[in-house]
């Protein structure tokens, strides 16, 4: 314990903040999902679709994507992965089209989340199998990945 | 770097703490929702639907509602969207009643959340265009708005 | 205000974090859900099927649950529950198996969120009823009950 | 600079269905969002709907039941069908760009291109 | 989807100011600021004058202005000039996604 030494207590706060948000490309062409650079990044970098994590510690990550699927003649199911240092950490799967009816369109919203652990040098990444069914085109804003620190390594 | 510098550590600290969590209110009449102002509120004031920023910083804002649906003979688009000073910032969708059959009743949750920079006086809302789906008889206290300053402004 | 007293803004610096990232246990058997106890645990204790808080606070708690249906001939109406001293403090529903169809499988996901304060030896829980349907085989990993401290109690 | 210019037959039958084509030039379709809009002579304007690059729609929901908005990026070109027309749906109709996304917003502009109209009369 | 309510007509003399209102509702005009403003000559497509409530497309006079309080937007012209004679529609976002027009106002310069 060092209540009274204000140096000690300093460099064992947990001041340090890092968090990204970012939305996904525009055109998507293979299972793991790309997003745009313009988004927010503080202290972490986005390199061929990943997150790279600067500084180690306790994250919290969230994605959420928006689906628009047009129904064939069975259901659909959509999953969406995340991936930590490629290696499935975590996923969320719904069904959708259930009723085997062809339907103009369904809207369907998927989230997941992750609290981890990451080294420097991790790296973050969304894997969805049904891609295709991402609404770039109605929603395109809809569908981000999201991180923040919540803790540092003492 | 002030690394040894305590005052200086401190000044660009990220201690300050802003929060909220609203609850819907019981009766609502109009798209855009109006939330008890009985919840918790923490360095954010509550007025006339919105809710109004007085700390600038990076915010986790998350919402959401529990819909409940008398299905009619075609499906229905349950849409969410948050508002940043009454502009559409992100929104989700969900399409339910997708059999086209009348059923009973069904049941369908949908969140949506958004991290972002927010300046003194913004103001955060929520649409939702099928207001009157909105569950607020048999589970009332499951539809919320919340944010959290996750880092206030250097 | 004490902004130029070092010690009087650490006594009041929001330093203290707990967090909690637990996974559902393999075999469940009633309504009530259990956690593996080898997750994340950190200024939070696990007990029969509770976290238990030890320091008090504003918490952000978050559950996510993977569903797997094997649908009769009606619907199901999944519901998760959030339980602060064993009073229900927020659930979230969802239909599926909507057309009545038998069909092989259906996926599921339902999250719910809170932000609440809690006491020291407040206990957080999480209740379904439909147990049976939660996918421990094929996604046991997907089934998280997670928590943060966002603000210590000054 | 983006043009657009409506093509379609000037008379249709009543109970028939009207189909028009509006054709963009100097822009990718796929880029944008794209509206119909019509106006009796001597009234206002009424939207009639909106289509995405993906093909999904958004329809105004008093003319839900009868309209079909499609889009064929191949020819950068989209589509307007209006079943059982009355003397009622006698009007100019125009194709409009509608609002865009751009950078992390959306950006609700209005429409901010328009074609010059094609007049349509319903008459046996 | 009702239309947004507009006065039928105004005037105004060269070199004065003149204000046409738009009343919405809670579910379009009132809930975004997404509302636009069109001037339509006769025999002729509407041009797009105004857009965000306030918002002047590139090559439009900022004799042209737009606010809105509540329920209601305006748009207002300034320093009135013959070639302003037209009609005005205002249009508004509504929480269907859809769009919907006003009844339009004739400005007659006089």
């Known amino acids: 314990d060092c209540s009274e030494d204000l140096l000690c207590i300093l460099k064992r706060a947990p001041f340090k903040k890092s968090w990204a948000y970012l939305q996904v490309a525009k055109h998507l062409d293979k299972t793991k999902l790309s997003w745009n650079k313009d988004g927010i990044l503080h202290g972490v970098r986005y390199q061929d679709g990943n997150l790279v994590i600067q500084f180690p510690g306790l994250y919290f990550i969230i994605c959420q994507l928006q689906f628009l699927v047009q129904c064939p003649n069975n259901s659909v199911d959509l999953k969406l992965e995340l991936l930590i240092n490629k290696h499935i950490k975590k996923q969320a799967l719904v069904t959708v089209c259930e009723s085997g009816m062809q339907t103009k369109h369904v809207y369907q919203n998927l989230s997941q989340f992750l609290l981890d652990y990451l080294q420097v040098n991790t790296t973050i990444s969304v894997n969805v199998d049904t891609f295709q069914y991402i609404d770039t085109s109605t929603f395109p804003l809809e569908n981000v990945l999201s991180i923040f620190l919540y803790s540092n390594s003492d | 770097d002030c690394s040894e510098d305590l005052l200086c550590i401190l000044k660009r600290a990220p201690f300050k703490k802003s929060w909220a969590y609203l609850q819907v209110a019981k009766h609502l009449d109009k798209t855009k929702l109006s939330w008890n102002k009985d919840g918790i509120l923490h360095g954010v004031r509550y007025q006339d639907g919105n809710l109004v920023i007085q700390f600038p910083g990076l915010y986790f804002i998350i919402c959401q509602l529990q819909f409940l649906v008398q299905c009619p003979n075609n499906s229905v688009d349950l849409k969410l969207e948050l508002l940043i000073n009454k502009h559409i910032k992100k929104q989700a969708l969900v399409t339910v009643c997708e059999s086209g059959m009348q059923t009973k009743h069904v049941y369908q949750n949908l969140s949506q959340f958004l991290l972002d920079y927010l300046q003194v006086n913004t103001t955060i809302s929520v649409n939702v265009d099928t207001f009157q789906y909105i569950d607020t008889s048999t589970f009332p206290l499951e539809n919320v708005l919340s944010i959290f300053l996750y880092s206030n402004s250097d | 205000d004490c902004s130029e007293d070092l010690l009087c803004i650490l006594k009041r610096a929001p330093f203290k974090k707990s967090w909690a990232y637990l996974q559902v246990a393999k075999h469940l058997d009633k309504t009530k859900l259990s956690w593996n106890k080898d997750g994340i645990l950190h200024g939070v204790r696990y007990q029969d099927g509770n976290l238990v808080i030890q320091f008090p606070g504003l918490y952000f708690i978050i559950c996510q649950l993977q569903f797997l249906v094997q649908c009769p001939n009606n619907s199901v109406d999944l519901k998760l529950e959030l339980l602060i001293n064993k009073h229900i403090k927020k659930q979230a529903l969802v239909t599926v198996c909507e057309s009545g169809m038998q069909t092989k499988h259906v996926y599921q996901n339902l999250s719910q969120f809170l932000l609440d304060y809690l006491q020291v030896n407040t206990t957080i829980s999480v209740n379904v009823d439909t147990f049976q349907y939660i996918d421990t085989s094929t996604f046991p990993l997907e089934n998280v009950l997670s928590i943060f401290l966002y603000s210590n109690s000054d | 600079q983006v043009q657009l210019q409506e093509s379609g037959p000037g008379l249709v039958k009543p109970s028939e269905t009207l189909s028009l084509t509006c054709t963009v030039s100097?822009?990718?379709?796929?880029?944008?969002?794209w509206s119909w809009i019509r106006q009796p002579a001597g009234k206002g304007l009424e939207w009639i709907g909106r289509?995405?690059?993906?093909?999904?729609?958004n329809y105004n929901p008093s003319l839900k039941s009868r309209v079909t908005i499609s889009v064929d990026t191949s020819k950068n070109q989209f589509s307007l069908k209006l079943s059982s027309m009355t003397a009622a749906d006698t009007a100019v109709y125009y194709c409009?760009?509608?609002?865009?996304?751009?950078?992390?917003?959306?950006?609700?502009?209005?429409?901010?291109?328009w074609g010059q109209g094609t007049t349509v009369t319903v008459s046996s | 989807q009702s239309a947004l309510t507009q006065p039928a007509s105004v005037s105004g003399s060269p070199g004065q100011s003149i204000t046409i209102s738009c009343t919405g509702t809670?579910?379009?005009?009132?809930?975004?600021?997404?509302v636009s403003w069109y001037q339509q000559h006769p025999g002729k497509a509407p041009k797009l004058m105004i857009y965000?409530?306030?918002n002047r497309p590139s090559g439009v006079s900022n004799r042209f202005s737009g606010s809105k309080s509540g329920n209601t937007a305006s748009l207002t012209i300034s320093g009135l000039q013959t070639e302003d004679e037209a009609d005005y529609y205002c249009?508004?976002?509504?929480?269907?996604?859809?769009?919907?027009f006003g009844g339009g106002t004739k400005l007659t310069v006089l």
């Open positions: 409009a760009r509608d609002y865009r996304v751009a950078g992390t917003y959306y950006y609700y502009y209005g429409l901010d291109v």
């Open positions: 965000e409530v306030s």
């Open positions: 100097g822009g990718s379709i796929s880029s944008y969002i």
């Open positions: 249009s508004s976002y509504t929480s269907r996604s859809t769009w919907v």
């Open positions: 289509i995405y690059a993906s093909g999904n729609t």
């Open positions: 809670s579910s379009d005009v009132g809930v975004y600021d997404y």
